[in-house]
C-alpha cells in the first residue's frame, strides 16, 4: 500500500488515521527534503490532485481539510514543489479509513447441526461498520467456571469435544474495531436443547388415482432422535400463501404423508423438524415441485430435474429442485 | 503449586510513569489463562484494575477508570505479567497485587505479596 | 456496568457466633461469585468461589448459597482466627466495556 514509500517528511491525519465516517477531518504534510524549501505543497487522494480546503501553515507544512468525509478508503498522498526540480517530489503516503463503531450484537444463537461434531454460533452484527471489525466468541461454562475465546469476523464453528466444562453454557460475543467495542448479552445454552436433527428430505411424490385423487410425499432423515416433530408446507406455486401440516415423526422408515389437492396444478413441498419440544427448527428443505395429474397417476422423483411426460399409465413429473423463493433457511 | 512475585513498585511524581512486573511460575501458559491485576488503597478495599486473557488470542480488559493510562502485557517467554501505568496520579497510590488461578476462570486462587506505589510529589 | 453491593460494612461478633454476610449483584451473574479473607499486610485468600463450592484448605465452617443476584456467605461459628475482612467478587465477565470493580466494598469482622 501507500504506507510503504520511502517518505521525505512526514503525513498525518487529525483526528486519526481512522476516523467515523462523516466527520471533518484534516490531513497534514510536513515536507524534509535536502536543499528544497518547497514553493508548494500538492495532496493527492487516490491519485488524483486536490484543488481546494489546502492551507499554507509555514515553510514546509500544509494542510488538507475535508468536510464530511464518507469514502470507507482512500489512499493519500503529498508531494512537494522544489526550485531547480522539474517533477514533484514525493513527501509521504498514508492510506486512511472511515466507517463505524460496531452496534451491539444481538441474536445470539448457538445451535448443534446432527454429526457435524461442532457448535455453531451466528448472531446479528448491526450495521455495516466500513472498517475491520473483529468478533470474540465467549463461551463459560456454568460448571467450571472455564472460558475459552474463539477470535472470528463472523459466525464460529466450535468443535463440541472442546466443550469440557459440562452442558450448560453462557455464550456472549464481543465486537471490536478500531472505533470502539460493545457486548451481546449472555446466552445460556444446555448442549442438548440445541441439537437440530440432521436434515428431512423429500424424495419423491406419487398420485394415486382413486375416487378422490390423493397424493403421498415421501420423505426421510438419518436422525437418530427419536422424538422430532416435523412441518411440512405447500403450496400451489402461483400461490403466495404456505398451508403448512405438522407431523410427530419417528424416522425408523420414510415417512408417507397424504394430501388431497387440486388437479392438473403445480405445487411445491417443503419439510423441516426439530427435536420435540426444544427450540431450533432446521431450515427449509430444498423446493420440491409435484404436478397433480389430470386424471392419470403421477410420480414425482427427486432424481430428474426438469419436466418429462411419458405415455402410459405411470407419468414422470419431474422437480426442478432449487428454486429460492421464500425458501428461507431459518432455525427461529 | 502457582507462584507470583510482583515487582517494580516505588515512589513516583504525579504524571509519571511505572512498569510493575509479575513474575510466575507453575502456570501451564499452553493453556487459556486469565491474569489480573487487583490493588489496593490504603486502609480502602480491594479494586479490580485490568486482567489478560491468553488462549488461542490474547484479550485484555480493565476497569473503566484505567482505560488509556494502564496497559497490561505479558511475556510468555519470560512467564512474566506486567502493568505499565502512565500519568499517574495520587490516588493511584496502592498495593498492587498480581493475581490468577492459573486457568480461564476469573477467581483468584493465588495472589502475589503485593508491590506498593506510591504516587507524591 | 455491573455493581457489587456488600453489607454490612462492618460487624462485631464473638467466637462460636454464626455471621452472615450478603452480596448483592445490579444483575444476573448465576453462580458466578468469590468470597475472599483478607488480614492486615497480607494478600486475599480465597475461600468460596462459583458461590458455594469451597476452596482448598478451607474449613467447612465456611459456606456460600445464592445466585443470580444475591448472595451469602455464612461462617457457621466464628474462630479466633476469623477475625478479618471479607470481600465478595463476580466472575462473570470482564470484558463488559464499563466495569468501574468487580469487588463488594468489603465487611470488617471484629471482635465484640
Known amino acids: 500500500g501507500i504506507t510503504n514509500i520511502n517518505c521525505s517528511g512526514h503525513i498525518w491525519v487529525e483526528p486519526a488515521t481512522i476516523f467515523k465516517m462523516g466527520m471533518n477531518i484534516s490531513i497534514y504534510c510536513q515536507a524534509a527534503i535536502k536543499n528544497c524549501q518547497p514553493r508548494k505543497l500538492h495532496f493527492y487522494k487516490n491519485g488524483i490532485k486536490e484543488r481546494f480546503q489546502i492551507t499554507r501553515i509555514n515553510k514546509t507544512t500544509a494542510r488538507l481539510w475535508y468536510k464530511n468525509f464518507l469514502e470507507p478508503h482512500a489512499s493519500m498522498y503529498c508531494t512537494a514543489e522544489c526550485p531547480k526540480h522539474f517533477q514533484e517530489t514525493l513527501i509521504c503516503g498514508k492510506d486512511i479509513s472511515s466507517g463505524y463503531p460496531p452496534d451491539i450484537p444481538d441474536e445470539v444463537t448457538c445451535v448443534i447441526y446432527e454429526y457435524s461434531g461442532n457448535m455453531t454460533c451466528t448472531w446479528n452484527a448491526g450495521k455495516l461498520t466500513y472498517i475491520d471489525t473483529k468478533y470474540v466468541v465467549h463461551v463459560k461454562s456454568l460448571e467450571t467456571e472455564e472460558e475459552q475465546q474463539y477470535l472470528t469476523s463472523s459466525y464460529i464453528n466450535i468443535s463440541t469435544d472442546s466443550l469440557q466444562g459440562g452442558k450448560k453454557y453462557l455464550v456472549w460475543v464481543q465486537a471490536a474495531n478500531a472505533l470502539g467495542m460493545e457486548e451481546s448479552k449472555q446466552l445460556q445454552i444446555h448442549l442438548d436443547d440445541i441439537v437440530i436433527p440432521s436434515a428431512a428430505v423429500i424424495s419423491r411424490a406419487e398420485t394415486i388415482n382413486a375416487t378422490v385423487p390423493k397424493t403421498i410425499i415421501y420423505w426421510d432423515s438419518q436422525t437418530t432422535i427419536e422424538k422430532v416433530s416435523c412441518e411440512m408446507r405447500y403450496k400451489a406455486t402461483t400461490n403466495q400463501t404456505w398451508n403448512v401440516k405438522e407431523f410427530d415423526t419417528n424416522f425408523t422408515y420414510v415417512q408417507q404423508s397424504e394430501f388431497y389437492l387440486e388437479p392438473n396444478i403445480k405445487y411445491v413441498f417443503q419439510v423441516r423438524c426439530q427435536e420435540t419440544g426444544k427450540r431450533y427448527w432446521q431450515p427449509w428443505s430444498s423446493l420440491f415441485f409435484h404436478k397433480t395429474p389430470e386424471t392419470v397417476p403421477q410420480v414425482t422423483s427427486k432424481a430428474f430435474q426438469h419436466d418429462t411426460w411419458n405415455s402410459g399409465l405411470t407419468v414422470a413429473s419431474i422437480s426442478t429442485g432449487h428454486l429460492t423463493s421464500d425458501n428461507r433457511g431459518d432455525i427461529g | 503449586e502457582v507462584q507470583l512475585v510482583e515487582s517494580g513498585g516505588g515512589l513516583v511524581q504525579p504524571g509519571g510513569s511505572l512498569r510493575l512486573s509479575c513474575a510466575a511460575s507453575g502456570i501451564d501458559f499452553n493453556s487459556n489463562y486469565y491474569m489480573c491485576w487487583v490493588r489496593q488503597a490504603p486502609g480502602k478495599g480491594l479494586e479490580w484494575v485490568s486482567c489478560i486473557y491468553v488462549g488461542s488470542h490474547v484479550n485484555t480488559y480493565y476497569a473503566n477508570w484505567a482505560k488509556g493510562r494502564f496497559t497490561i502485557s505479558r511475556d510468555n517467554s519470560k512467564n512474566t505479567l506486567y502493568l505499565q501505568m502512565n500519568s499517574l496520579r495520587a490516588e493511584d497510590t496502592a498495593v498492587y497485587y498480581c493475581a490468577t488461578s492459573g486457568s480461564s476462570v476469573l477467581y483468584f486462587k493465588f495472589w502475589g505479596q503485593g508491590t506498593l506505589v506510591t504516587v507524591s510529589s | 456496568d455491573i455493581q457489587m453491593t456488600q453489607s454490612p460494612s462492618s460487624l462485631s461478633a464473638s467466637v462460636g457466633d454464626r455471621v452472615t454476610i450478603t452480596c448483592q449483584a445490579s444483575e444476573n451473574i448465576y453462580s458466578f461469585l468469590a468470597w475472599y479473607q483478607q488480614k492486615p499486610g497480607k494478600a486475599p485468600k480465597l475461600l468460596i468461589y462459583?458461590?458455594?463450592k469451597l476452596a482448598a484448605g478451607v474449613p467447612s465452617r465456611f459456606s456460600g448459597s445464592g445466585s443470580g443476584t444475591d448472595f451469602t456467605l455464612t461462617i457457621s461459628s466464628l474462630q479466633p482466627e476469623d477475625f478479618a475482612t471479607y470481600y465478595c467478587q463476580q466472575t462473570n465477565r470482564y470484558s463488559n466495556p464499563d466495569i468501574y470493580n468487580v469487588f463488594g466494598q468489603g465487611t470488617k469482622v471484629e471482635i465484640k
Open positions: 462459583s458461590a458455594s
